[in-house]
Amino acid sequence: TLNSVLNSNAIKNLPPPLGGAAGHPGSAVSAAPGILYPGGNKYQTIDNYQPYPCAEDEECGTDEYCASPTRGGDAGVQICLACRKRRKRCMRHAMCCPGNYCKNGICVSSDQNHFRGEIEETITESFGNDHSTLDGYSRRTTLSSKMYHTKGQEGSVCLRSSDCASGLCCARHFWSKICKPVLKEGQVCTKHRRKGSHGLEIFQRCYCGEGLSCRIQKDHHQASNSSRLHTCQRH
């Protein structure tokens, strides 16, 4: 959860007008040291912050992407990095700032007039593209709202889960992403023990459905760490 990285996140937000603790994440009882900034103008936010650890783009803000901070760095150490502006180099759509997408390794403007054909090419030709850029406000809203009338069915190529029909999620399959079924109660799920570990999966499972969480199967508690089976279980 977010609390696990609070201590490494050095944003210091000032107390809110209602006098409570920082609203997201944390509370009066769980805010980590350094989150609240004492004194001063309460409507000022100090924006010099340390990088936020992440495992995938979806954990970062809409103007960020998740990657190793150093070229060729350890895949397990990833942080949220500022998105790349137009004409900067990229490897996938999520790296480009809102209003842009990744075309032939360069962030280009997502001009609606020629975007449809290009994005369809890019989905099929790119390595691990995670998100498209469709408008100036949010590059990670659904593809279907702009270009497709129907949501992707099981096996359809997708960029993110909102491209898929209800009950499906967008998950990695070899080096592209396709719509796969959201996991049901009792189905085996993947619990990532360390940040960044699911960047290595080439057959990614969906997450557990609503009301379910990925937990160790009760009769596997005695098994060794490496062989523990996780299944989707009711909260």
Epitope: P16, C60, Y137
Partner: nanobody, 125 residues
Framework: EVQLVESGGGLVQAGGSLRLSCTAS????????VGWFRQAPGKEREFVTA????????DYADSVKGRFTISRDNAKNTAYLQMSSLKPEDTAVYYC??????????????????WGQGTQVTVSS
């Protein structure tokens, strides 16, 4: 501009469950952090839980961890708060709020720029 409307509140016995919904109008919802706050009579409004734009990051106040679950469906422009094992001290007006999620960081309460009108949750003993 995002308008938020909460629903699903009501009267429930201690130990029971409720599911609150927060339905948004406006395209900015899918790019927003969504948070739930609550305010009990005579008390300050307090943070309950929050979820980032994609649903990949969530956080909970210690008082509700393990009992409450936040989720969202961007296709339906809706966020949910599943509340179980309810206690009398959970009685409050529950507010849904949304704010910009451009950067992965902590939001203070005043940075939630859109707020719903609230829905009453009463837990009887």
């Amino acid at each position: 501009e995002v308008q938020l409307v909460e629903s699903g509140g009501g009267l429930v016995q201690a130990g029971g469950s409720l599911r609150l919904s927060c339905t948004a109008s406006g395209s900015a919802f899918s790019s927003s952090v969504v948070g739930w706050f609550r305010q009990a009579p005579g008390k300050e409004r307090e943070f309950v839980t929050a979820i980032n734009w994609s649903g990949a990051r969530t956080d909970y106040a210690d008082s509700v961890k393990g009992r409450f679950t936040i989720s969202r469906d961007n296709a339906k422009n809706t966020a949910y708060l599943q509340m179980s094992s309810l206690k009398p001290e959970d009685t409050a007006v529950y507010y849904c709020a949304a704010g910009s999620d451009r950067y992965a960081r902590v939001l203070t309460e005043y940075e939630y720029v859109w707020w719903g009108q609230g829905t009453q949750v009463t837990v009887s003993s």
